[in-house]
């Protein structure tokens, strides 16, 4: 019952973060800026991964996405290959753990089946969260490092002057989307990997036992001891007998022709 | 390569018109901001008038009433008609691009500038 809870909450946390990561991917306020009160009207501008955004004061807003590659920071495109690595991973997270859900019978799926299943969506979920939180961690760290601009920096380009618009930069509400929903897709996986355990058929070494029929009616079926997972009701892996075994420090040696005086 | 060229500039009378015109290329004149600068001799750089991609003017209180920008579309350019002039308007004017959206860093571009002389 604890390993079915623990599967199925760890599935659902992982799930919300997962979709936390979808948004955070989508969202555009990635780092907002305060730009200087431009004297046509103030602006608030702010970006995301894929497009960049500008709110006048008179409500009109307007994005675009990025022109070209060229001209975009190397560490934005890195950022985007982990939160589309952690999405991916998280996606087919998601489906192997569907069927591994212990809730969800399909076919007759062995209990090691489910277990390895479970272990494998848990690690993707880790990996999944670990992708997520670096990818807002880089993008939050090109903030603080790019976006600290006391001057504006300024060079001439072709018919004039070309500057970077100075800028406060704040952490937009994406970031903070990202690492909660990373947060939780990691702590879904190690709580999948934590429900793999308890699923797991547990590797019990039995001494070796030799039967003695006590009556000729009596017959040895095989697989008479077979490993218990330790859940649910055992009703396939009980005794075969009661009496006729015993372990091999118990069993008394007769004496036979090949005995030597 | 985004380029700012302005035209229109010359020698004019108190009380004349003008109208100067910034063409661009490499940018889409619906930029967030198009403005219009001035810098007299020995002053700083001042704001005249802009437009913003929303449709938001403004002016300076010193041209309010005698000048007009605007934008044209199919020729690509922004005009600032000058009307009334002054001495005082006399200066640099430099036409000016704001980007926002459509790239990471914030931009500013600026033209070469063109040269209005009221004097009679």
């Known amino acids: 019952m604890a390993v079915t809870a623990c599967q199925g909450l760890g599935f659902v946390v992982s799930l919300i973060g997962i979709a936390g990561i979808i948004a955070a991917t989508c969202m555009d306020q990635w780092s907002t800026q305060d730009l200087y009160n431009n004297p046509v009207t103030a602006v608030f501008n702010y970006q995301g991964l894929w497009r960049s955004c500008v709110r006048e004061s008179s409500g009109f807003t307007e994005c675009r996405g990025y022109f070209t590659l060229l001209g975009l920071p190397a560490m934005l495109q890195a950022v985007r290959a982990l939160m589309i690595v952690g999405i991916v991973l998280g996606a087919i997270g998601l489906l192997v753990s569907i069927f591994a859900l212990k809730c969800i019978r399909i076919g007759s799926m062995e209990d090691s089946a489910k277990a390895n299943m479970t272990l494998t969506s848990g690690i993707m979920f880790i990996v999944s969260g670990l992708c997520a939180i670096a990818g807002v961690s880089v993008f939050a760290n090109m903030l603080v490092t790019n976006f600290w601009m006391s001057t504006a920096n300024m060079y001439t380009g072709m018919g004039g002057m070309v500057q970077t618009v100075q800028t406060r930069y704040t952490f937009g509400a994406a970031l903070f989307v990202g690492w909660v929903a990373g947060g939780l897709t990691l702590i879904g996986g190690v709580m999948m990997c934590i429900a793999c355990r308890g699923l797991a058929p547990e590797e019990t070494n039995y001494k070796a036992v030799s039967y003695h029929a006590s009556g000729h009616s009596v017959a040895y079926k095989p697989g008479g001891f077979k490993a218990s997972t330790g859940f649910g009701s055992n009703t396939k892996n009980k005794k075969i007998y009661d009496g006729g075994a015993r372990t091999e420090d118990e069993v008394q040696s007769y004496p036979s022709k090949h005995d030597y005086v | 390569q985004v380029q700012l060229v302005e035209s229109g500039g010359g020698l004019v009378q108190p009380g004349g018109s003008l109208r100067l015109s910034c063409a661009a290329s490499?940018?889409?004149?619906?930029?967030?901001?198009m403005a219009w600068y001035r810098q007299a001799p020995g002053k700083q750089r001042e704001f005249v008038s802009g437009l913003t991609r929303g449709g938001s003017i403004n002016y300076a209180d010193s041209v309010k009433g005698r000048f007009t920008i605007s934008r044209d579309f199919a020729k690509n350019t922004v005009d600032l008609q000058m009307n009334s002039l002054k001495p005082e308007d006399t200066a640099v004017y430099y036409c000016?691009?704001?980007?926002?959206?459509?790239?990471?860093?914030?931009?500013?571009?600026w033209g070469q500038g063109t040269l209005v002389t009221v004097s009679s």
């Open positions: 000016n691009a704001e980007i926002y959206t459509g790239t990471f860093y914030p931009r500013s571009y």
């Open positions: 490499g940018v889409d004149i619906s930029s967030d901001v």
